[in-house]
Interface confidence: medium
């Protein structure tokens, strides 16, 4: 902290500018008054501080405001926010998409720092939900923002937002998240025709029960094999040859690369050796022809 | 079969960081999470949190600002880290794979758990 | 979070005995409820799961029923190798969280 010493005279700032950066440290917490700085905050940033300098620009706005800095000074922090810890943020009260953008801006390129988590944290909350706007943006700045929440925070996300993500958003997310945007997606896509629909929702895919999957192989949709092998093991089992043909199309041909991994291994498991003989892709360890098939409990077939 | 093992120091001093790692054999990483689980000496279990294969967590509130587990799938193993521990952190610590290639998840295999004493 | 209330926490039996043991949510979790028996010194083991699904190699003596809120674990005939510690749990949502124990002792 720095000590309590007397303004030289001729030194006391009148407006924040360049002259600041030739002050030394005790000099800048002297001379520049806090309510002047607070007013002038959207200058701070144009000018080369040092991070030394900084330590007490920031040290003098904590004075102002102990209870955490009003919207005002925090829409105009800049590379002063780097400063801030997460203990300051939790005090502020964002509710700007605007103020959200410009403190992004500043750690834009850089993975998301518990500063920045908790500045998202406080403003969705504040927010009540995480509407399209505040995804658009959380998303266009950090990509795997939405598969960084958790599946209680993703039920807060309306089925309108789901419009926002991308592909590519979805990368990093795993089943239980899933489980919970599939139903969202499904809801938020319910009106689109058949092709446009499956571009929309394959993402969301792997948390898709069987009759869904049931469903789509009705409408020709040619699923490729990578969204295949990301779908449900028990929402798959229960499909037949006939259904997985429709619902792979000319992509069938692709379960020989993949007859030894879930869900394709079990699924094989399943089916009887005659029916998966007519895909003419030489998969084995079907049912055995003449064999009775046995209603084995999901577990069992799935160990 | 698949087999877990836990390992890291038994002794911890508060303030200290906690540190454990889980290895895998006799399966793979992918395709399930993996959960780190905790019991106080003659208590219940807590659930402490868990990893993707693909590096996403999830962590209980109750110690998420405390908590960081990391997976390392080269070496089929997955670690935990609890900081500013104290001596309510003292417990046998598990870590155990969720079964969820189907719905409901439920925990198949444990390690079989290692004691650790937060004590100066 | 949802809580999981056991009881009862503890119960005395005799070999042969049919036992329950029961287990309430805080609020609906479907069918998302397992149950674990615990051996001093042990790592729980898997007995049931998705509330009435018996894990492959747990003998036919245990079984698992209910839904929503209210579940139930029972054992038809104790014996010997039954005398532990039980635990239910939610898989329902994070965080996953179990019930307090019933510690199943010998009269």
């Known amino acids: 902290e720095v000590e309590k010493t007397a303004c030289p005279s001729g030194k006391k700032a009148r407006e924040i500018d360049e002259s600041l950066i030739f002050y030394k440290k005790w000099e800048l917490e002297a001379c520049v008054d806090a309510a002047l700085l607070a007013t002038q905050m959207d200058r701070v940033n144009a000018i080369p501080f040092t991070y030394e300098q900084l330590d007490v620009l920031k040290h003098k706005l904590d004075e102002l405001y102990p209870q955490g800095y009003p919207e005002s000074v925090i829409q105009h922090l800049g590379y002063l926010f780097l400063k801030m810890s997460p203990e300051d943020i939790r005090k502020w009260n964002v509710t700007s998409l605007e103020t959200l953008k410009a403190l992004l801006e500043v750690n834009k390129g850089h993975e998301m720092s518990p500063q920045v988590a908790t500045l998202i944290d406080r403003f969705v909350k504040g927010r009540g939900q995480l509407d399209k706007d505040t995804l658009d943006t959380l998303t266009a700045f950090y990509p795997g923002y939405l598969c960084s929440l958790s599946p209680e925070e993703l039920s807060s996300v309306p089925p309108s937002s789901i419009w926002a993500v991308r592909p590519q958003d979805l990368d990093t997310c795993d089943p239980r998240q899933l489980d919970v945007l599939y139903p969202k997606a499904r809801l938020a896509f319910q009106n689109m025709n058949g092709s446009e629909y499956f571009v929309k929702i394959q993402s969301f895919l792997g948390g898709a029960p069987t009759e869904d999957l049931k469903a789509l192989s009705q409408q020709n949709v040619s699923m490729d094999l990578a969204t295949f092998m990301k779908l449900r093991t028990d929402a798959v089992l229960p499909l037949t040859v006939a259904e997985v043909q429709k619902l792979l199309g000319p992509h069938v041909e692709g379960l020989k690369a993949e007859e030894r991994h879930r869900p394709v291994r079990d699924w094989i498991l399943r089916q009887r050796q005659d029916d998966l003989d007519t895909l003419g892709l030489g998969l084995q360890g079907g049912i055995p022809n003449g064999y009775l098939v046995l209603d084995l409990s999901m577990q069992e077939a799935l160990s | 079969q698949v087999q877990l093992q836990e390992s890291g120091p038994g002794l911890v001093k508060p303030s200290e960081t906690l540190s454990l790692t889980c290895t895998v054999s006799?399966?793979?990483?992918?395709?399930?999470?993996w959960s780190w689980i905790r019991q106080p000496p003659g208590k219940g279990l807590e659930w402490i949190g868990y990893?993707?294969?693909?590096?996403?967590?999830n962590y209980n509130p109750s110690l998420k600002s405390r908590v960081t587990i990391s997976v390392d799938t080269s070496k089929n193993q997955f670690s935990l880290k609890l900081s500013s521990v104290t001596a309510a952190d003292t417990a046998v610590y598990y870590c155990?794979?969720?079964?969820?290639?189907?719905?409901?998840?439920?925990?198949?295999?444990w390690g079989q758990g290692t004691l650790v004493t937060v004590s100066s | 979070d949802i809580q999981m209330t056991q009881s009862p926490s503890s119960l005395s039996a005799s070999v042969g005995d049919r036992v329950t043991i029961t287990c309430r949510a805080s609020?609906?979790?479907?069918?998302?409820l397992n149950w674990y028996q615990q051996k001093p010194g042990k790592a729980p083991k898997l007995l049931i799961y998705?509330?009435?699904s018996l894990q492959s190699g747990v003998p036919s003596r245990f079984s698992g029923s209910g839904s929503g809120t209210d579940f139930t674990l029972t054992i038809s005939s104790l014996q010997p190798e039954d005398f532990a510690t039980y635990y239910c749990?939610?898989?329902?949502?994070?965080?996953?969280?179990f019930g307090g124990g019933t510690k199943v002792e010998i009269k």
């Open positions: 155990a794979r969720e079964w969820i290639p189907s719905r409901p998840y439920y925990f198949d295999y």
């Open positions: 006799g399966g793979s990483i992918s395709s399930y999470y």
């Open positions: 990893i993707y294969y693909s590096g996403s967590t």
């Open positions: 609020q609906s979790i479907s069918s998302y």
């Open positions: 998705a509330a009435s």
């Open positions: 749990q939610q898989s329902y949502s994070t965080p996953l969280t």
